[in-house]
Interface confidence: low
């Protein structure tokens, strides 16, 4: 505990390592013939305290013993945990200009004795691994602390390893470098950790374990799957394992799933049959192992095997709908539409659809395959027709779905009543209706069909539809519904051989239109004025237009204009008014109204009727 320096020595009592809360005496002594020249009595020894290389205190006032000019003893208290540096310097008081000269220094370490190590945990990775133990060291000692891990077992087996903790490294784990073999499966082993530093020592409680307690098998490797006869639902999972494994846990899931299917397999010997897989589905498989049925630890999960199950022929029924359009007196165009099967029904990549149109008396059959989800043909208007569609993948085809081609809106008695369309939120519309009042045949199902009321939508875009059971009188439509767009919604009631429909317009959100209709002409016929206009461009309508309003007033008049409100009909683009005085010049304009309000006015036109007014 003495640091030999040129000018003198510094000693510490009781020791340079002390427990927290203890005091220490530091003595600084000059060597013979050292000190201030000529006047030994002018030697003044001072003690400086440094923490982290920063001067924090001059201990001049803590002097407890002084041999003038030869040695001084200082008492230091309240030292904080860790290392503190003390430097003794010589101050020659007769020479104020010279700085104090360093004599010697000492480092004092303040710490605590180690706590008994706790929570010892040992593990051997695989049958050929080595035993490694970790523990909780307890509170930081702030001193270099040595740890000894000792293992003892049968046949006088003993083994020990050491490591230390200090301010740079932490010792809470040691690998003993020995391998426990399965033939010692029933044997008991004891480990103990001893901690020792300059302030004391402590020992853990003995920790007892068996081979099975600590050996964690290596995860299975070389995982593969064999699909029996290219089946999409049955496969044999195979893997390699360590020799002593008796229990496996398998987990597998479709890649987009959030929950695993779990299977326990005893004595599987690297093989297990799975029977409930979904065809044409990306799966992830993992396996874990255990060396004993009741004791021991599971291995980590193996690396994932990711693979797609093979295809199987499609199942399920295609959802078919159609449109009929008369071309002339003896021909009609039939457009068939169907929805793609969902993946669990398609069970593979759909390569094509088989479409059949057949006259019921079997006189005519039209057949085709298509990769699209629609098909159009011109057929005679005579006869009763039926259509069927099936979906095919590489393994086969689904059962055909049949639909009778009837006149969808041909039977007034089958028309649903009180059809309404209410906006529910930005992207759906609630459609409700009442059943037909006097249907002479039972309603088998309702079809709610909708399409945007925009130019060319019948030819450009397929319809959207929902099939509704006959006892339901409402449907929430959301597919392809956008705000500020007006949709034509039809509710069809279908019986076995007839159809009736009712139509309504609806939107999911609306605003007042951006502009009013543009008046294109005002003509006078038989004492009535006919106002003609062009409809508001589709993007500017911003929902379903309920009314048009025609305003007029005498030119230069300050009176309120008169107005005529007309129900909006897409097909109508002119309207008569008959309350204008002859030979008076009027200004006329139009606006459009949605459920959200009225548009700004359209263009103004002046007109002076000539004829006799009513």
């Amino acid at each position: 505990n003495i640091d030999v320096c040129k000018l003198g020595t510094v000693t510490v009592q009781p020791a340079p390592v002390i427990p927290l809360g203890s005091a220490a005496n530091i003595s600084c002594s000059l060597n013979p013939k050292q000190g201030c020249s000529h006047y030994p009595s002018s030697n003044e020894l001072i003690l400086l305290k440094f923490v982290n290389d920063v001067l924090v205190e001059n201990l001049h006032g803590k002097k407890v013993h002084d041999h003038t000019g030869h040695s001084s003893t200082f008492q230091v208290t309240n030292l904080s945990l860790g290392m503190t540096l003390f430097v003794c310097k010589l101050n020659c008081s007769n020479s104020q200009k010279k700085p104090p000269v360093p004599v010697c220094g000492v480092e004092i370490s303040v710490g605590v004795a180690p706590e008994p190590p706790q929570n010892i945990s040992c593990v051997q990775e695989g049958e050929n691994g080595t035993v490694a133990c970790s523990w909780n060291s307890g509170k930081v000692t702030y001193l270099k602390t040595n740890y000894t891990l000792q293992l003892s077992g049968p046949n006088n087996l003993t083994c020990q390893k050491q490591c230390f903790s200090d301010n740079r490294q932490n010792c809470n784990r040691l690998d003993l470098g020995i391998n426990l073999s399965p033939d010692l499966a029933e044997s008991r082993f004891i480990v103990r950790v001893t901690a020792i530093n300059d302030l004391g020592n402590s020992s853990s409680l003995p920790h007892t374990f068996t081979f099975l307690d600590i050996v964690i098998p290596l995860p299975p490797w070389d995982i593969r799957i064999n699909f029996l006869n290219a089946s999409g639902s049955r496969g044999t999972l195979q893997w390699e394992d360590e020799g002593q494994v008796v229990l496996n846990q398998l987990r597998y899931q479709p890649l987009n799933s959030t929950s695993w299917n779990m299977v326990n397999a005893t004595n599987a010997k690297g093989k297990y049959d799975l029977r409930d897989l979904r065809p044409f589905t990306e799966y992830e498989f993992q396996i874990s192992s255990k060396l004993h049925l009741s004791g021991g630890s599971w291995s980590n999960w193996s690396e994932s095997l990711r693979t797609r199950t093979p295809e199987e022929e499609p199942v399920g029924i295609l959802d078919i709908w159609y449109m009929k359009q008369d071309i002339d007196y003896d021909r009609q165009q039939i457009s068939l539409f169907w929805k793609s099967l969902n993946p669990s029904e398609a069970r593979g990549k759909i390569l094509h659809y088989q479409v059949t149109l057949q006259e019921v008396t079997k006189k005519t059959t039209l057949q085709n395959t298509t990769r699209h989800t629609s098909w159009t043909r011109v057929i005679p208007r005579t006869g009763a027709w039926t259509a069927s569609v099936s979906a095919a993948n590489s393994k086969g085809a689904s059962a055909p779905t049949h639909i009778n081609i009837v006149d969808l809106c041909g039977t007034g008695l089958l028309a649903p009543h009180q059809v309404s369309a209410k906006s529910e939120n930005m992207d759906n519309i609630l459609v409700t209706w009442q059943p037909p009042k006097k249907a002479d045949s039972a309603v088998r199902e309702y079809i709610v069909e909708w399409r945007a009321l925009q130019p060319g939508s019948i030819t450009k875009f397929p319809p959207h539809w929902l099939r509704i059971p006959p006892d339901n009188m409402s449907a929430l439509i959301s597919e392809n519904i956008k705000p500020y767009i007006c949709y034509e919604i039809r509710v069809h009631a279908l019986s076995e051989s007839q159809g009736g429909c009712s139509s309504i317009r609806g939107d999911s959100k609306h605003k007042a239109p951006v502009s009013g209709p543009h008046i294109t002409a005002i003509t006078e016929k038989k004492e009535r004025l006919f106002i003609s206009w062009t409809h508001i461009p589709f993007p500017e309508q911003r929902g379903c237009i309920l009314h048009y309003r025609i305003y007029w007033k005498e030119r230069d008049s300050t009176a309120q204009p008169e107005l005529c409100e007309i129900q909006y009909r897409r097909s109508q683009n002119s309207h008569p008014i008959s309350s204008l005085q002859p030979r008076v010049t009027y200004v006329l304009w139009m606006t459009a109204v949605t459920a959200a309000g009225e548009s700004p006015q359209g263009n103004e036109r002046e007109f002076c009727p000539q004829g006799k007014a009513n």
């Epitope: 945990s121 593990v123 051997q124 990775e125 691994g129 490694a132 970790s134 932490n170 809470n172 784990r173 690998d175 964690i216 995860p219 980590n300 999960w301 193996s302 690396e303």
Partner: nanobody
Framework: QVQLQESGGGLVQAGGSLRLSCAAS????????MAWFRQAPGTEREFVAG?????????FYDDSVKGRFAISRDSAKNTVWLQMNSLKPEDTAVYYC?????????????????????WGQGTQVTVSS
């Protein structure tokens, strides 16, 4: 979806230093075991350093880097760092960041590739002599 993105690799002279960073997105990684592995051409991917993720974050190092490399994490920033000092030519490799979404406290498990369920794309470190 969880993603790990390494950065900070590059070319450095022997004896120099580099600091690798691994940014995790998609989940909070403060409780998960995190590790750095490396793979030199023609060799298996090997453990370099790891954090146990057991709340108190025990640090683990391969013997070959002990005293030279330091692993740390900033949970608030979802970032794990590897400070590499006194680099040697044999440290040349692609360095990968890995995360295990279950807490791992055994040294043996921390070292195993199979423990980790998320991996980054890697960053190249080249140490020239």
């Amino acid at each position: 979806q969880v993603q790990l993105q390494e950065s900070g690799g590059g070319l450095v002279q022997a004896g120099g230093s580099l600091r690798l960073s691994c940014a995790a997105s998609g989940r909070t990684f403060s409780n998960y075991a995190m590790a750095w592995f490396r793979q030199a051409p023609g060799t298996e991917r090997e453990f370099v350093a790891g954090l146990s993720g057991s709340g108190g974050d025990t640090e683990f190092y391969d013997d070959s880097v002990k005293g030279r490399f330091a692993i740390s994490r900033d949970s608030a920033k979802n970032t794990v760092w590897l400070q590499m000092n006194s680099l040697k030519p044999e440290d040349t490799a692609v360095y990968y960041c890995a995360a295990a979404t279950h807490v791992v406290v055994h040294y043996g498990l921390v070292r195993r590739r199979g423990t980790y369920d998320y991996w980054g794309q890697g960053t190249q470190v080249t140490v020239s002599s």
